[in-house]
């Protein structure tokens, strides 16, 4: 009981990070202009990994696109592989973990084999909220080295925007839930990797007890059976309850009136 | 069409308040932030504050230091100045503004004259 | 606060030739992340409330013919008429839109010569 509330926790707990995971690479507030010498400002600035925005004081928001591969900096794209290549190990981790709830029974699937797949998605999962770790301390890394670097036309920043002197960049509010979502895919894993334990058959040292019946000579071996082999198919009806689970990933940053691409 | 009615010319006495009214029509009330700018006779323009109709948020220029109040009224989309401890020298024609792109403002009220004398 | 001073003060010019005046702030109007300067053009006609000529420092607004061009970034900005007309006789103010407190020019009145 216990081993299938820690999968079944683990398993929430890192879905729940993915889609923070998933939500934070999408989010555009990576960095937002910092705003301690003027708290109310007309023109706001704040970029994300795949574009940069302007929301005016006048409610109108434009958003612009990265639209080059070449001239961004490497450590942007660096950090958008981390937490691409977490959403996907996530991703797989989630639907191997699926299949490997305990709670669900597909055809004759042996207990062992959950074990395994419990551990494989647990692994997926450590790496995958280390990968959203990585990258979002790599880019907060990489906010404060060029806080103070912001001077007049000078070529830094994401896409090789124009700074101007009134111009820097703190954290945004993707970073907060990058590094939350990532923890909580990272402690997801962990709890799926104690959960295999439990599920693993362990060895015993029980002798073997021989049951003798007329005409048929059978032995009964509990013990000795690796951690590989099944213990035998189960016979109970039992339903399945394969519910795909929907994330809803709808991110604005900074709620505006008017929002144009 | 976009029309930005104000209320008429108002005299107070130094010390008093005035409101002046703003409303709105043509076109989504709660869309656009309202700006009221103020023109002392013969002089340029002043920049006083502004209200988010859709949040309620409001910026106000420090020189009238907390004189200005700005509120709403979504019902009527009638947006409102209030200016406080009147003096000689806030004798002025006040405007409303909408703000549109770039923060500039599109459409402009035909003017209140508030006047100023003991 | 951003200082936006304009010059001249006043500006005599013939009907049919160009009018051009200036307006500089006392710090950049350019914005980075869109790489926009936040200077605005109005036009004011005695009696009458200012009317929006140009923002973005050279967007014209729809509707305003296109002898009126505005251009410039950073600091210093130029709004040219390219041939005037009797109906561009106004004060023209510049405004800067880009900080708090929004801030206007002190205006260049145009006349006729």
């Known amino acids: 009981m216990a081993v299938t509330a820690c999968q079944g926790l683990g398993f929430v707990v890192s879905l729940i990070g993915i889609a923070g995971i998933i939500a934070a690479t999408c989010m555009d507030q990576w960095s937002t202009q910092d705003l301690y010498n003027n708290p109310v400002t007309a023109v706001f600035n704040y970029q994300g990994l795949w574009r940069s925005c302007v929301r005016e004081s006048s409610g109108f928001t434009e958003c612009r696109g990265y639209f080059t591969l070449l001239g961004l900096p490497a450590m942007l794209q660096a950090v958008r592989a981390l937490m691409i290549v977490g959403i996907v190990l996530g991703a797989i981790g989630l639907l191997v973990s699926i299949f490997a709830l305990k709670c669900i029974r597909i055809g004759s699937m042996e207990d062992s084999a959950k074990a395994n797949m419990t551990l494989t998605s647990g692994i997926m999962f450590i790496v995958s909220g280390l990968c959203a770790i990585a990258g979002v301390s790599v880019f907060a890394n990489m906010l404060v080295t060029n806080f103070w670097m912001s001077t007049a036309n000078m070529y830094t920043g994401m896409g090789g925007m124009v700074q101007t002197v009134q111009t820097r960049y703190t954290f945004g509010a993707a970073l907060f839930v990058g590094w939350v979502a990532g923890g909580l895919t990272l402690i997801g894993g962990v709890m799926m990797c104690i959960a295999c334990r439990g599920l693993a058959p362990e060895e015993t040292n029980y002798k073997a007890v021989s049951y003798h019946a007329s005409g048929h000579s059978v032995a009964y071996k509990p013990g000795g059976f690796k951690a590989s082999t099944g213990f035998g198919s189960n016979t109970k009806n039992k339903k399945i309850y394969d519910g795909g689970a929907r994330t809803e990933d709808e991110v604005q940053s900074y709620p505006s009136k008017h929002d144009y691409v | 069409q976009v029309q930005l009615v104000q209320s008429g010319a108002e005299v107070k006495k130094p010390g008093a308040s005035v409101k002046v009214s703003c409303k709105a029509s043509?076109?989504?009330?709660?869309?656009?932030?309202m700006n009221w700018v103020r023109q002392a006779p013969g002089q340029g323009l002043e920049w006083m504050g502004n209200i988010d109709p859709y949040y309620g948020g409001t910026s106000y220029n420090q020189k009238f230091k907390g004189r200005v109040t700005l509120t709403i009224d979504k019902s009527t989309s009638t947006v409102y100045m209030e200016l406080s401890s009147l003096r000689s020298e806030d004798t002025a024609v006040y405007y409303c503004?909408?703000?549109?792109?770039?923060?500039?403002?599109?459409?402009w009220g035909q003017g209140t004259t508030v006047t100023v004398s003991s | 606060d951003i200082v936006m001073t304009q010059s001249p003060d006043s500006l005599a010019v013939s009907l049919g030739e160009r009018a051009t005046m200036n307006c500089k702030s006392s710090?950049?109007?350019?914005?980075?992340?869109?790489?926009?300067?936040?200077l605005t053009w109005y036009q004011q006609k005695p009696g009458q409330p200012p009317k929006l000529l140009i923002y973005w420092a050279s967007t014209r607004k729809s509707g305003v013919p296109d002898r009126f061009t505005g251009s410039g970034s950073g600091t210093d900005f130029t709004l040219t008429i390219s041939s005037l007309q009797a109906e561009d006789v106004a004060v023209y103010y510049c405004?800067?839109?880009?900080?708090?407190?929004?801030?206007f020019g002190g205006g260049t009145k145009v006349e006729i010569k």
């Open positions: 405004q800067n839109d880009y900080s708090y407190p929004l801030t």
């Open positions: 710090q950049s109007l350019l914005n980075s992340g869109n790489l926009k300067n936040y």
């Open positions: 043509g076109y989504s009330f709660t869309g656009y932030n």
């Open positions: 503004a909408r703000m549109y792109h770039g923060n500039a403002f599109d459409y």
